[in-house]
Amino acid sequence: EEELQVIQPDKSVSVAAGESAILHCTVTSLIPVGPIQWFRGAGPARELIYNQKEGHFPRVTTVSESTKRENMDFSISISNITPADAGTYYCVKFRKGSPDTEFKSGAGTELSVRAKPSAPVVSGPAARATPQHTVSFTCESHGFSPRDITLKWFKNGNELSDFQTNVDPVGESVSYSIHSTAKVVLTREDVHSQVICEVAHVTLQGDPLRGTANLSETIRVPPTLEVTQQPVRAENQVNVTCQVRKFYPQRLQLTWLENGNVSRTETASTVTENKDGTYNWMSWLLVNVSAHRDDVKLTCQVEHDGQPAVSKSHDLKVSAHPKEQGSNTAAENTGSNER
């Protein structure tokens, strides 16, 4: 009689992560008597996957009734495949004895596992930066297989070219990760801008996966200040306004100084938003000129988003206004935010 052959008809099998893999194996004879075992890998370090005779293998089921005496089909199904299951599986016939001895092995079936990349996560710099500065964004995606993957960066739909990408590990692995760093130059118009990392992989049936970062979380647009003197409201009263324009984020504190002395401090609240996402705000100060013998230096000092204060001054000519006889009251500190 012809000697038993172990036939593994599939040289390779490819399975999606989470699915079941069927590994086919048939023998051509019932002799010699003895069990079949399945291993992953070859040599002394091979891993037992299934033993027909004994053991508990919760993820493995036999395709046919392998316990039947005449059975010659020893195909198995492995459930809930993960990338860690990739490898070459061997169906091995043993000869019954004490102990059983290996008789013949199949040629092996290479199991490759296809796994989708995780949703890309984009992260920006820890601290805010101002326009004209270059900031770095990173994008990461994990757990995909095979290794081939493409990653692109976009800013508001325009593809970026200044980035570096690594896929790890470099050698063979059950699954892979991608890490990319892109450099982006900020502009004053970037409050509404988005940076997008796009990952494409063979397993993705839809469009590429996207991760986004809003530049509103990265940019700081410092304000421009303008102090102007309004026409006299009433006798001896002058209205001075401080226009704080085009700033982002909203966190802003304004202090009025009269000849270097703090007159009033207020926090920006009722701001107007510009189309580009920056804010404008206006504060005004009513000054009673009759309280001053000399010219007054009015300073609008702004502290924006925890940064060092910037200021703008305005010289108020007291001599240009008639003085009230016998009046020595202090400058009036009433003021208000205006839209």
Epitope: S112, R114, P146, A200, V202, T203, Q205, G206
Partner: antibody
Amino acid sequence: QSVEESGGRLGTPGTPLTLTCTVSGFSLSSYVMGWFRQAPGKGLEYIGIISSSGSPYYASWVNGRFTISKTSTTMDLKMNSPTTEDTATYFCARVGPLGVDYFNIWGPGTLVTVSL
Amino acid sequence: DIVMTQTPSSVEAAVGGTVTIKCQAGQSINSYLAWYQQKPGQRPKLLIYYASTLESGVPSRFKGSGSGTDYTLTISDLESADAATYYCQSWHYISRSYAFGGGTEVVVK
């Protein structure tokens, strides 16, 4: 699971023509679908695909000659301005469950003849 | 676009024999290669994908191999039912585009 093309007929140059691919047994919202063609006695030629989310991608030679779109149950190929060179059997196909690198379900094809 | 060069354009072999069809890509396609069988007046039928993975239900007489730019389809123990035209098809993971070889007609004597 199957796909089937329809809409093939005798057309005239310059007159738009729309082919439809109807699927059964699976959802168009889960798979990439493709359009291909085969001129009489010639080989297979890739036209374009539409992703599960509805974004079309075309072969570089298409240059606006075709438009791919889909509804929940059908995928269309519009021949915007056919010429006699577009005479062919048009196939729609679905990519495999493991990835977009191969097509495992093909329709029987529908014949389009563009003639003066 | 990647150009796929398939050879030979036609091959003849006897029942029980072996046929080898080659496909060369203009650049590396990282094993993203599929083989199809098409008989006259019929739709293409997937045989092999990812260079060497046999599609379910396809006899193991069909064997795919290769990597990088060079791929081979081997049909052994030829049967008369194997008479058909065979096409290779690539997918390029960077351009995400597809290309077909010109086809090989297999005639079984």
